[in-house]
């Protein structure tokens, strides 16, 4: 019976490979702190597997617990830019449903221009994550220097 | 037909557990800003399972989705050293084949003396990936300190 | 035969689903450089799935590779608070059983007021993870800022 | 291949300054520490201090007590040495040296010395 | 400060037989997995020469029958096989921490 069971969980695609890299497409107006994302293999080394984008923000398509990274880089930074424009903060958060809004992973660069983290955290299909890099200083477009992810590990 | 499919694609040499954590074995001659890598049980805590080493450089066996992590650390670094030899950059790309030559992470140091990152990327058998730190300082050779690593996540 | 064997090596609990994120509690008495973590869903978006805390530490109870990640906020912190109070060091190892006592992960701040990093590393069942902060600054215990995971990666 | 070119010999009366120059040749020069080494007489090596040309910082060795200050000019890739209050114990051969591509404290490239004389 | 202690002060070897010079360290000059120790020579009149960086590393250009080792705070530089031109004082000096410190210097002669 429990032989039967593991057939029935492991066909491949519910193995749960879903997994995005995503890069910088453009900051937000003005009063919107938020990066919008882009990604998909004609952008470069981009991609995603089952997670979808939403203007810009990532969405989740199958419950789990995920490991979340991001590094962001300050365009035109120094460490003498970046302390006197502190504080510069980046969060990132389940900004939808309203229901499930929190903040993740939050950094400051303080007197340094890139940040760079990852976590684990359970995530429901139909979140969307935000990133929100608060501050006057511009985040680098390089894909090599700015880049989100998030990569579903278990159920 | 699809759980016999299944079974065909899960033997658990093809789930695809290719996995290496590297320690740094030495740094290069002047010309030449790459560190070079050393793994295997006899040296601690490093290890390679796939992916192979090539004169120190790391060469990829399994085509894939792979999380990379660095962690390097300054050799008798202060905030003041840091600044002081800026720019002291840390760049982890495809170096071989030179038709994929790509970088993939990109770090400067700025006033601090570790930098520390991960992503997600897509590649190939036969890619060899190379780590470049340029500047004027050393790498700390402790291996809390300074470690380079892949995990293939997905096909 | 292979297909048999493959049954074999795969029920869902074979496949190391060991994983764990913890926020911080709180510190140790003042000799004690321990970091204190608790997890649990009603404490928000910690877990453990196969690794248990001991006395606030996390010990393992999968043999195998884990990635291993820790991101570390300092609290009331700015770069000139950080760098009046260097040397401040996280450093995460085994620290039972006396005999695998090893540093597996180090970062200083420098003048920073975060500290994230991760590795690939081998653990044992039984393997306790300790996460020292050595210095006189108080971690931030906001969940979002402060956190310590492991994940199984393979055998 | 980086060059270090010193100012010729000086003779100086106790209590005066002296004033020892170090021309590199090359175009790293804002990037490495610059270091001043004494050498007595039939004598070992003294570290005296080294500044870092980028941005002007310095370090000594205590054991100079404030008598030696350490400049450099970036236009003209100069480094100088000022070593004030000479006394008889200060007569020696005074080099500077630097690394050659890790910028920490040992020495591949030295200039030729200059030889300090005090005396009355 | 570290005090860099050489010896023997002076040392006379037949030529091409092995010569050692000893440096011991006041306390460890090794760090972030290396060992911040250095040697050079020095011929009269001239400014010294460096021969081994980071305890074993041999300096561009430097004959191989030059080699160093050790760690921690003891440290030797050997000389294979000693030739004519290699008579001088010989200094081994630390950069773990400022400020470096200099060895008093060796006298290798020919017997």
């Known amino acids: 019976q429990r032989f039967a069971q593991a057939q029935q969980q492991l066909p491949l695609e519910s193995l749960g490979w879903d997994v995005a890299e995503l890069q910088l497409n453009h900051t937000g107006p003005q009063q919107d702190p938020r990066l919008y994302w882009q990604g998909g293999p004609a952008l470069g080394r981009s991609f995603l597997h089952g997670p979808e984008l939403d203007k810009g923000q990532l969405r989740i398509h199958r419950d789990g617990i995920y490991m979340v990274h991001i590094q962001v880089t300050l365009a035109i930074c120094s460490s003498t830019t970046a302390s006197r424009h502190h504080p510069t903060t980046l969060a990132v958060g389940i900004c939808s449903p309203a229901s499930r809004s929190i903040s993740l992973l939050r950094l400051s660069f303080h007197q340094g221009c890139t940040i760079a983290s990852q976590r684990l955290t359970p995530l429901a299909r139909g979140d969307t994550l935000c990133t929100n890099l608060t501050g006057t200083l511009l985040p680098s477009r390089n894909t090599d220097e700015t880049f989100f992810g998030v990569q579903w590990v278990r159920p | 037909q699809r759980f016999a499919q299944a079974q065909q694609q899960l033997p658990l040499e093809s789930l695809g557990w290719d996995v290496a954590e590297l320690q740094l074995n030495h740094t290069g001659p002047q010309q030449d800003p790459r560190l070079y890598w050393q793994g295997g049980p006899a040296l601690g805590r490093s290890f390679l399972h796939g992916p192979e080493l090539d004169k120190g450089q790391l060469r990829i066996h399994r085509d894939g989705i792979y999380m990379v992590h660095i962690q390097v650390t300054l050799a008798i670094c202060s905030s003041t050293t840091a600044s002081r030899h800026h720019p002291t950059t840390l760049a982890v790309g495809i170096c071989s084949p030179a038709s994929r030559s790509i970088s993939l992470l990109r770090l400067s140091f700025h006033q601090g003396c570790t930098i520390a990152s991960q992503r997600l990327t897509p590649l190939a058998r036969g890619d060899t990936l190379c780590t470049n730190l340029t500047g004027t300082l050393l790498p700390s050779r402790n291996t809390d300190e300074t470690f380079f690593g892949v995990q293939w996540v997905r096909p | 035969q292979r297909f048999a064997q493959a049954q074999q090596q795969l029920p869902l609990e074979s496949l190391g689903w060991d994983v764990a994120e913890l926020q911080l509690n709180h510190t140790g008495p003042q000799q004690d450089p321990r970091l204190y973590w608790q997890g649990g869903p009603a404490l928000g978006r910690s877990f453990l799935h196969g690794p248990e805390l001991d006395k606030g530490q996390l010990r393992i109870h999968r043999d195998g590779i884990y990635m291993v990640h820790i991101q570390v906020t300092l609290a009331i912190c700015s770069s000139t608070t950080a760098s009046r109070h260097h040397p401040t060091t996280l450093a995460v190892g085994i620290c039972s059983p006396a005999s695998r006592s090893i540093s597996l992960l180090r970062l200083s701040f420098h003048q920073g007021c975060t500290i994230a990093s991760q590795r690939l590393t081998p653990l044992a069942r039984g393997d306790t993870l300790c996460t020292n902060l050595t210095g006189t600054l108080l971690p931030s215990r906001n969940t979002d800022e402060t956190f310590f995971g492991v994940q199984w990666v393979r055998p | 291949e980086v060059q270090l070119v010193q100012s010729g010999a000086e003779v100086k009366k106790p209590g005066s300054s002296v004033k020892v120059s170090c021309k590199a040749s090359g175009d790293t020069f804002p990037r490495y520490n610059m270091h001043w080494l004494k050498q007595a007489p039939g004598q070992g090596l003294e570290w005296m201090g080294a500044?870092?040309?980028?941005?002007?910082?310095?370090s000594y060795n205590q054991n100079f007590k404030g008598r030696v200050t350490l400049t450099a000019d970036k236009s003209t890739s100069t480094a100088y040495m000022e070593l004030s209050s000479l006394r008889s114990e200060d007569t020696a051969v005074y080099y500077c040296?630097?690394?050659?591509?890790?910028?920490?404290?040992?020495?591949?490239?030295w200039g030729q010395g200059t030889l300090v004389t005090v005396s009355s | 400060d570290i005090v860099m202690t050489q010896s023997p002060d002076s040392l006379a070897v037949s030529l091409g037989e092995r010569a050692t010079i000893n440096c011991r360290a006041s306390k460890s000059v090794s760090s972030s997995g290396y060992s911040f120790m250095h040697w050079y020579q020095q011929k009269p009149g001239q400014p010294p020469k460096l021969l081994i960086y980071?305890?074993?590393n041999l300096e561009s250009g430097v004959p191989d029958r030059f080699s160093g080792s050790g760690s921690g705070t003891d440290f030797t530089l050997t000389i294979s096989s000693l030739q004519a031109e290699d008579v001088a004082v010989y200094y081994c000096q630390h950069s773990r921490e400022f400020p470096p410190t200099f060895g008093q210097g060796t006298k290798l002669e020919i017997k």
């Open positions: 040296a630097r690394n050659s591509y890790y910028d920490y404290a040992w020495f591949t490239y």
């Open positions: 980071l305890a074993s």
């Open positions: 500044i870092f040309p980028g941005n002007g910082e310095t």
